[in-house]
């Protein structure tokens, strides 16, 4: 009679994570008597996957009735496959004895596991940055297999080119991770902008996964300040306004100084929002000119989002008729305020 052969017809099998894998194995003879065992890997460190007669293998079931004496089909099904199950599986015939000895092994079936990448997580810089600055965004996705993967970056639908991507580990692994860093130049119009990381993988059937970051969490648009003197509101009274424009985020504190002395401090509350997502705010100061002998230097000082204060001044001529004058410095923060100075 011809010597027993162990036949594993499939050289490789690919299974999606969570599904069951069927590993086929048949023998050509009932002799010699002895059990079949399945192993993952070869050599002394091989892992026992299934033993016909003993051992606990809750995820493994035999495809046919392996207990029947005439059975020659020792195919198994492994349930709930994960990337950790990837490897080469060997169906091995043992000859019964004391102890049982390995008689013949099949050629092996390589099991590869297709595992979806996790949803990409995009994170931006820890601190806000101002327009014209370049900031870095990172995108991470984990747990996918096979290793081949495509990652793209977009800003408001426009593909970015300045990024660097790594897939780890470099060698063979049960699953892989991708890490990418993109550089984005901020503009004053970016409050409503989004940065998108898009990951495409064979397991996603052409429907890529996306992770997003809102630039509103990254950008700081400093305000522009303008101090103006309004026409006389009543005899000897002048209305001075400080217009705080195009700032983001809203967190802003404004202080009026009269000849360098603090006159009033307020926090921006009822702001108006511009189409680009930035804010405007205005603060008023009512000045009683008759209470002053000399010219008055009025300063609108703004602290925006915890940054160093910026200011703009206006010289109020007491001797002559009130006229609009101003001198620039810079600005940040918001509030609406009315104040009489006597």
């Amino acid at each position: 009679e011809e010597e027993l052969q162990v036949i594993q017809p499939d050289k490789s099998v690919s299974v999606a994570a969570g599904e069951s894998a069927i590993l086929h194995c048949t023998v050509t003879s009932l002799i010699p008597v002895g059990p079949i065992q399945w192993f993952r890997g070869a050599g002394p460190a091989r892992e026992l996957i299934y033993n016909q007669k003993e051992g606990h293998f809750p995820r493994v079931t035999t495809v046919s009735e392996s207990t029947k004496r005439e059975n020659m089909d020792f195919s198994i099904s492994i349930s709930n496959i994960t990337p950790a199950d990837a490897g080469t599986y060997y169906c091995v015939k043992f000859r019964k004895g004391s102890p049982d000895t390995e008689f013949k092994s099949g050629a092996g079936t390589e099991l590869s596991v297709r595992a979806k990448p996790s949803a990409p997580v995009v994170s931006g810089p820890a601190a806000r940055a101002t327009p014209q600055h370049t900031v870095s965004f990172t995108c991470e996705s984990h747990g996918f297999s096979p290793r081949d993967i495509t990652l793209k970056w977009f800003k408001n639908g426009n593909e970015l080119s300045d990024f660097q991507t790594n897939v780890d580990p470099v060698g063979e692994s049960v699953s892989y991770s991708i890490h990418s860093t993109a550089k984005v130049v901020l503009t004053r119009e970016d409050v409503h902008s989004q940065v998108i990381c898009e990951v495409a993988h064979v397991t996603l059937q052409g429907d890529p996964l996306r992770g997003t970051a809102n630039l509103s969490e990254t950008i700081r648009v400093p305000p522009t300040l303008e101090v103006t003197q309004q026409p006389v509101r009543a005899e000897n009274q002048v209305n001075v306004t400080c217009q705080v424009r195009k700032f983001y985020p809203q967190r802003l504190q404004l202080t009026w100084l009269e000849n360098g002395n603090v006159s009033r401090t307020e926090t921006a509350s009822t702001v108006t929002e511009n189409k680009d997502g930035t804010y405007n705010w205005m603060s008023w100061l009512l000045v009683n000119v008759s209470a002053h002998r000399d010219d008055v230097k009025l300063t609108c000082q703004v602290e925006h989002d915890g940054q160093p204060a910026v200011s703009k001044s206006h010289d109020l001529k007491v001797s002559a008729h009130p006229k609009e004058q101003g001198s620039n410095t810079a600005a940040e923060n918001t509030g609406s305020n009315e104040r009489n100075i006597y």
């Epitope: 460190a45 026992l48 007669k53 003993e54 051992g55 606990h56 207990t67 004496r69 019964k96 004391s98």
Partner: antibody, heavy 114, light 108 residues
Framework: EVQLQQSGVEVVQPGASVKLSCTAS????????MHWVKQRTEQGLEWIGR????????KYAPKFQGKATMTADTSSSTAYLQLSSLTSDDTAVYYC???????WGQGTTLTVSS | QIVLTQSPAIMSASPGEKVTLTCSAS???????LYWYQQKPGSSPKLWIY???NLASGVPPRFSGSGSGTSYSLTISSMQAEDAASYFC?????????FGGGTKLEIK
């Protein structure tokens, strides 16, 4: 439902023999080895041996060679453990265990006493 | 034969405490063939961990197993009152199969 039902309490005189039984239900007894384990009061577990009910082939721990004999009757789905030349050292609880190791009988208490 | 030595033989732990039981083999045991059982007084042993690190059905996730070669361990991340029991390691890597002497774990 898988069950291993063992015979009841045995009280036997020194020098005699006893045959303990373990009846399997819920599975084909030929599909698995059947193991026997000894546990003396408040002590550890000792592996006695295992039998392949399909062909009667068995393996014993050296300590139990000559003391224990395992047999199986596939028609009644029952495994047996015979213990001979009993002494007080054989007083213990004896468990049968299915080869997959998660199913144990409830144990048979054997007392050897004159 | 492979002798399995468990330590400590007896120990007590407070609720919430991390507990590690060890099982040392006199010669190498393949990790596929190293199992752990839990036994409470008056009951048959229950399969607790199989193939070194896999939890049997119904075993709480605070339990874990690890090891290779001649050194294996069972760890409870946070001891609970219901974990008080005896734990036995078991090898079926080579005949004769053997159990460790057991560790009796008590709750303080």
């Amino acid at each position: 439902e898988v069950q291993l039902q063992q015979s009841g309490v045995e009280v036997v005189q020194p020098g005699a023999s006893v045959k303990l039984s373990c009846t399997a239900s819920g599975f084909n007894i030929e599909a698995y080895y059947m193991h026997w384990v000894k546990q003396r009061t408040e002590q550890g577990l000792e592996w006695i041996g295992r039998i392949d009910p399909e062909d009667g082939e068995s393996k014993y721990a050296p300590k139990f060679q000559g003391k224990a004999t395992m047999t199986a009757d596939t028609s009644s789905s029952t495994a047996y453990l015979q213990l001979s030349s009993l002494t007080s050292d054989d007083t213990a609880v004896y468990y049968c265990v299915r080869g997959s190791y998660e199913y144990w009988g409830q144990g048979t208490t054997l007392t050897v006493s004159s | 034969q492979i002798v399995l030595t468990q330590s400590p033989a007896i120990m007590s732990a407070s609720p919430g405490e991390k507990v590690t039981l060890t099982c040392s083999a006199s010669s190498s045991v393949s990790s596929s063939y190293l199992y752990w059982y839990q036994q409470k007084p008056g009951s048959s042993p229950k399969l607790w961990i199989y193939s070194t690190s896999n939890l049997a059905s119904g075993v709480p996730p605070r339990f874990s197993g690890s090891g290779s070669g001649t050194s294996y361990s069972l760890t409870i991340s946070s001891m609970q009152a219901e974990d008080a029991a005896s734990y036995f390691c078991y090898q079926w890597s080579s005949y004769p199969y053997t159990f460790g002497g057991g560790t009796k774990l008590e709750i303080k």
